[in-house]
Interface confidence: low
């Protein structure tokens, strides 16, 4: 997991060059990634779908390395929730930025646990026609 921080930082810097004026949204992060437990705990199955979700506008090689690492940490038969993130919304940009910022700081890395947790609350779920959940 140690590699996750520098890899995420690289993606973050690249994303920030493209998108200015988009604030980090801790609320989005908590809605999407945390369990009901306190303090927030995360596992790779909860996080993986979000890295898959930001794949489209990320460097192919770097994002795939991150996904590969998270895949290794996943319990073999643990279900992975597919998520739907609205295309073309300010919240979506904020969401991507938040994911990258949190991992760049290493704040989420220490919260990763090997023990499965309940499915995260999917705060950004959208099933509207014509909106692609991995399309940013």
């Amino acid at each position: 997991m140690l590699e996750l921080q520098p890899l995420s930082r690289g993606l973050l810097e690249d994303y920030q060059k493209k998108e200015t004026g988009v604030p980090e949204s801790n609320r989005t992060l908590l809605l999407c990634l945390t369990s009901d437990s306190q303090p927030p705990r995360l596992n790779s199955s909860a996080i993986l779908p979000y890295f898959r979700a930001i794949r489209p506008l990320s460097d192919k090689n770097i994002i795939d390395k991150i996904i590969e690492q998270l895949d290794k940490l996943k319990f073999q038969h643990e279900p992975e929730t597919e998520i739907s993130v609205p295309a073309d919304t300010f919240e979506c940009k904020s969401f991507i930025l938040t994911i990258l910022q949190q991992f760049s700081k290493g704040e989420l890395n220490s919260k990763l646990e090997g023990k499965p947790i309940p499915n995260p609350l999917l705060g950004l779920d959208s099933t509207r026609t014509g909106h692609h959940h991995h399309h940013h």
């Epitope: 493209k18 506008l57 192919k60 991995h134």
Partner: antibody, heavy 118, light 111 residues
């Protein structure tokens, strides 16, 4: 090496049905979104359908919606396209396509030919 | 739907010269600073092959003589220097919104 092999194309009468299959190999099929794209006799390319990596989400253009169904069997590494209420304008070469991050189609199969004619 | 207009419909370029193909979208296809426009090459009797993804990224294994540029509504595929094997039809495609749409194609002939 990424390989996508389509099958099931045939000559069918208007109003008929057909099921296309695409056998995928050389990559982790369950990690990728997949699409069907067709090429009409006048060589125009048309997007037909997309399915997410786990199969939870499907997308279609309006002229296809309700007539075609895209599905996948990740255990068998196979993509499907069930076509019904076929029209003459559905005559085309149908390509199975791998998606990268859903916004890019990076590998295309050789295609399977569908002809709708009475 | 987003309409993609490619020009020219066909062009003939001398070996070693530059080929420029344009793709204009009826509305912006950029998102988060990235143009969601892709370029494909199709040779007779073959399936399309991805050349450039997200406006300017060269797909692995594609020769560096191919390059893409542009943003919002105007995108360009450049081939320089043109080689014999580049004779093909080139398509642009947007994935900014559903339905995904393709340009009508540009047929490149090598003189």
């Amino acid at each position: 090496e990424v390989q996508l092999v389509e099958s099931g194309g045939d000559l069918v009468k208007p109003g008929g049905s057909l099921k296309l299959s695409c056998a995928a190999s050389g990559f982790s099929f369950s990690n990728y979104g997949m699409s069907w794209v067709r090429q009409t006799p006048d060589k125009r390319l048309e997007w037909v359908a997309t399915i997410s990596y786990g199969g939870s989400y499907t997308y279609y253009p309006d002229n296809i919606k309700g007539r075609f169904t895209i599905s996948r069997d990740n255990a068998k590494n196979t993509l499907y396209l069930q076509m019904s209420s076929l029209k003459s304008e559905d005559t085309a070469m149908y390509y199975c396509v791998r998606g990268y991050g859903y916004d890019t189609m990076d590998y295309w199969g050789q295609g399977t030919s569908v002809t709708v004619s009475s | 739907d987003i309409l993609l207009t490619q020009s020219p419909a066909s062009l003939a370029v001398s070996l070693g010269q530059r080929a420029i193909i344009s793709c204009k979208a009826s509305q912006s296809v950029s998102f988060a600073g990235t143009g969601l426009m892709h370029w494909y090459q199709q040779k007779p009797g073959q399936q399309p092959k991805l050349l450039i993804y997200r406006a300017s990224n060269l797909e692995a294994g594609v020769p560096t003589r191919f390059s893409g540029s542009g943003s919002r509504t105007d995108f360009t595929l450049n081939i320089h220097p043109v080689e014999e094997e580049d004779a093909a039809t080139y398509f642009c495609q947007q994935s900014r919104e559903y339905p995904w749409t393709f340009g009508g194609g540009t047929k490149l002939e090598i003189k």
